[in-house]
């Protein structure tokens, strides 16, 4: 099929970068200005991506693959292909319908993007908190109660049962 | 083609007001979110405000009870409205689509004006 295809159809002769031009008796035309093809064959060229505004060109657009984005300093990229830049908050905060809040108490992002997360519960691994929790970071679970007592056997206790809206320490 | 112009900048003393405009076309207005953003001298791009085609408004923290966004359907333009004004608001100034409806965030598909320059400054 492909042998017959390209014996009857002079576009599959076209090369990446440039378009079969029908108005031109198909005759192989480069891609004209800010426009790619990236396969053989094509019977148009595609339209360069423009990075405009919060978007800043990474790849410029060459005549065989398209220009590649990311974001300004302060967004950062979501999507396939950075489809879409998404401003930056500080760590200990979230992004919402209002702006960039501080995690609530109990809650902690440690990045610059993302939601608040609840903080780890120590209890539910029969631990407890070495370290608290702050905005910024989770807390450190350490050893369980009992392995801190004073005599205390080395084998750790089962967990106790996870109770269901068993709230974060 | 879309356009979105930018007008209404221009040096200010702290205190004062200015109220900048963006002129649309190419696109149906009307149905479209709009917002507007800056870029400080030496900084990256800051989200400033949203008005849904419906009306409801958003303003970060920094601009709350000082900045007015809203839309004139009739004349296909957005406008901010700056009082108050502090050299830190110093910064070109961006209208652009706000395809998302989520604060703070662009696409690719959203459309910029060119900028119009605001200076704060006694």
């Known amino acids: 099929f492909e042998r017959t295809r390209s014996l009857q159809d002079p576009c599959s002769n076209c090369p990446a970068g440039t378009f079969c031009d029908n108005n031109r008796n198909q005759i192989c035309s480069p891609c004209p200005p800010n426009s790619f093809s990236s396969a053989g064959g094509q019977r148009t060229c595609d339209i360069c991506r423009q990075c405009k505004g919060v978007f800043r060109t990474r790849k410029e657009c060459s005549s065989t693959s398209n220009a590649e984005c990311d974001c300004t300093p302060g967004f950062h990229c979501l999507g396939a292909g950075c489809s879409m830049c998404e401003q930056d908050c500080k760590q200990g905060q979230e992004l919402t319908k209002k702006g960039c809040k501080d995690c609530c108490f109990g809650t902690f992002n440690d990045q610059k993007r993302g939601i608040c997360r609840p903080w780890t519960n120590c209890s539910l691994d029969g631990k407890s908190v070495l370290v608290n929790g702050t905005k910024e970071r989770d807390v450190v679970c350490g050893p369980s109660p009992a392995d801190l007592s004073p005599g205390a056997s080395s084998v750790t206790p089962p967990a106790p049962a996870r109770e269901p809206g068993h709230s974060p320490q | 083609e879309v356009q979105l112009v930018e007008s209404g900048g221009g040096l200010v003393q702290p205190g004062g007001s200015l109220r900048l405009s963006c002129a649309a076309s190419?696109?149906?207005?009307?149905?479209?979110?709009m917002s507007w953003a800056r870029q400080a001298p030496g900084k990256g791009f800051e989200w400033v405000s949203g008005?849904?085609?419906?009306?409801?408004?958003y303003y970060t923290e920094s601009v709350k009870d000082r900045f007015t966004i809203s839309r004139d359907n009739s004349k296909n333009t957005v406008y901010l409205q700056m009082n108050s004004l502090k050299p830190e608001d110093t910064a070109v100034y961006y209208c652009?689509?706000?395809?998302?409806?989520?604060?703070?965030?662009?696409?690719?598909?959203?459309?910029w004006g060119q900028g119009t320059q605001v200076t704060v400054s006694s």
């Open positions: 190419g696109f149906t207005f009307s149905s479209s979110a």
């Open positions: 008005i849904y085609s419906g009306g409801s408004t």
């Open positions: 652009a689509t706000w395809g998302t409806l989520r604060f703070g965030v662009w696409a690719e598909y959203d459309h």
